[in-house]
């Protein structure tokens, strides 16, 4: 099944102490999916989207081993036929730097 989109979303961190927010969105026909965020291949966090939403935002603490940096990827899973879990392809990577550059 198709990969989710991934991007850093505001508020952007101004320092290493600030949290980072990474949004992961499945295609429109997969609401309520289970999402996994990876950093360098390691699981960082798992979240389930509300049934009326097709994505989640991972909120990662600043000043910890989980943030900042990257690369981060995300993936989602849905129940397919016969209640079998299906995993999406991995998203493109996203990296985090401090401070986030202005537009």
């Amino acid at each position: 099944i198709p990969a989710p989109s991934i991007r850093l979303v505001p508020p952007y961190p101004s320092s290493q102490e600030d949290p980072i927010h990474i949004a992961c969105m499945a295609p429109g026909n997969f609401p309520g999916a289970n999402f996994t965020l990876y950093r360098g291949g390691q699981v960082v966090q798992l979240l389930q989207a509300p049934t009326d939403q097709r994505g989640v935002t991972f909120n990662l603490s600043g000043g910890s081993s989980k943030a900042p940096g990257g690369p981060f990827h995300c993936q989602y899973g849905v129940l397919g036929e016969l209640n079998q879990s299906q995993l999406s392809d991995l998203s493109e990577p996203v990296n985090v730097s401090f401070p986030v550059p202005t537009w």
Epitope: P10, P11, P13, S15, P19, M25, V100, W103
Partner: antibody, heavy 122, light 107 residues
């Protein structure tokens, strides 16, 4: 309909710690769609963001308050709290707790408590 | 921290007037801007998010526009219940910051 209610002492002695709790009713504090914040307003002045916390415990706070701010969340009680240490008269303000809505790039406070006045005085 | 500057700090207007409040950010914040209304002794109320999206339940006489550093809140036809103080707030980056407020008074 979600409601937020601040509670805590209205008078705090200088150099002591201000402690406030916000109780959330009508909705779960553990939703992935929300964050929980504190905003204050000195008498006759504007709004100042103090900090925000997520149900997971991830926090962000205003660096202007340096390291005086501590926030916590208690999912079992559907509450979150604020502690501000080493207070001075400049910390006298109405303190609001608020629920923030978060979806993709949207990020705003959509529900507020009524506010509680905290006076710092000896 | 990003500084948010509102103008004017206060204005006097009559019922039925079109009112415009401006908010300027000290750096580009894209459209990551919210507007709130606050009446005396009450908590703020969300009006506009993402610079131009109207909050559910807010009347369409309120509108927001702008992107980058310059933003505007417009009340198309001022009503008695609209006399209040209005604040902009950026959420481009931490720390979240508010403008100083614009008090809309009865002329």
């Amino acid at each position: 309909q979600v409601q937020l209610q601040e509670s805590g002492p209205g008078l705090v002695t200088p150099s002591e710690t201000l402690s406030l709790t916000c109780t959330v009713s009508g909705g779960s504090i553990s939703s992935v769609s929300y964050y929980w914040g504190w905003v204050r307003q000195p008498p006759g002045k504007g709004l100042e963001w103090i900090g925000s916390i997520y149900y997971s415990g991830t926090t962000a706070h205003n660096p202007s308050l340096k390291s005086r701010v501590t926030m916590a969340v208690d999912t079992s009680k559907n509450q979150f709290s604020l502690s501000l240490s080493s207070v001075t008269a400049a910390d006298t303000a109405v303190y609001f707790c608020a629920r923030g809505w978060r979806y993709y790039e949207d990020y705003y406070f959509d529900h507020w408590g009524q506010g509680t006045l905290v006076t710092v005085s000896s | 921290a990003i500084r948010m500057t509102q103008s004017p700090s206060s204005l006097s207007a009559s019922v039925g007037d079109r009112v415009t409040i401006t908010c300027q950010a000290s750096q580009d914040i894209s459209n990551y801007l919210n507007w709130y209304q606050q009446k005396p002794g009450k908590a703020p109320k969300s009006l506009i998010y993402a610079a131009s999206s109207l909050q559910s339940g807010v009347p369409s006489k309120f509108s927001g526009s702008g992107s980058g550093t310059d933003f505007t809140l417009t009340i198309s036809s001022l009503q008695p219940e609209d006399f209040a103080t209005y604040y902009c707030q950026q959420y481009y980056s931490y720390p979240l910051t508010f403008g100083g407020g614009t008090k809309v008074e009865i002329k």
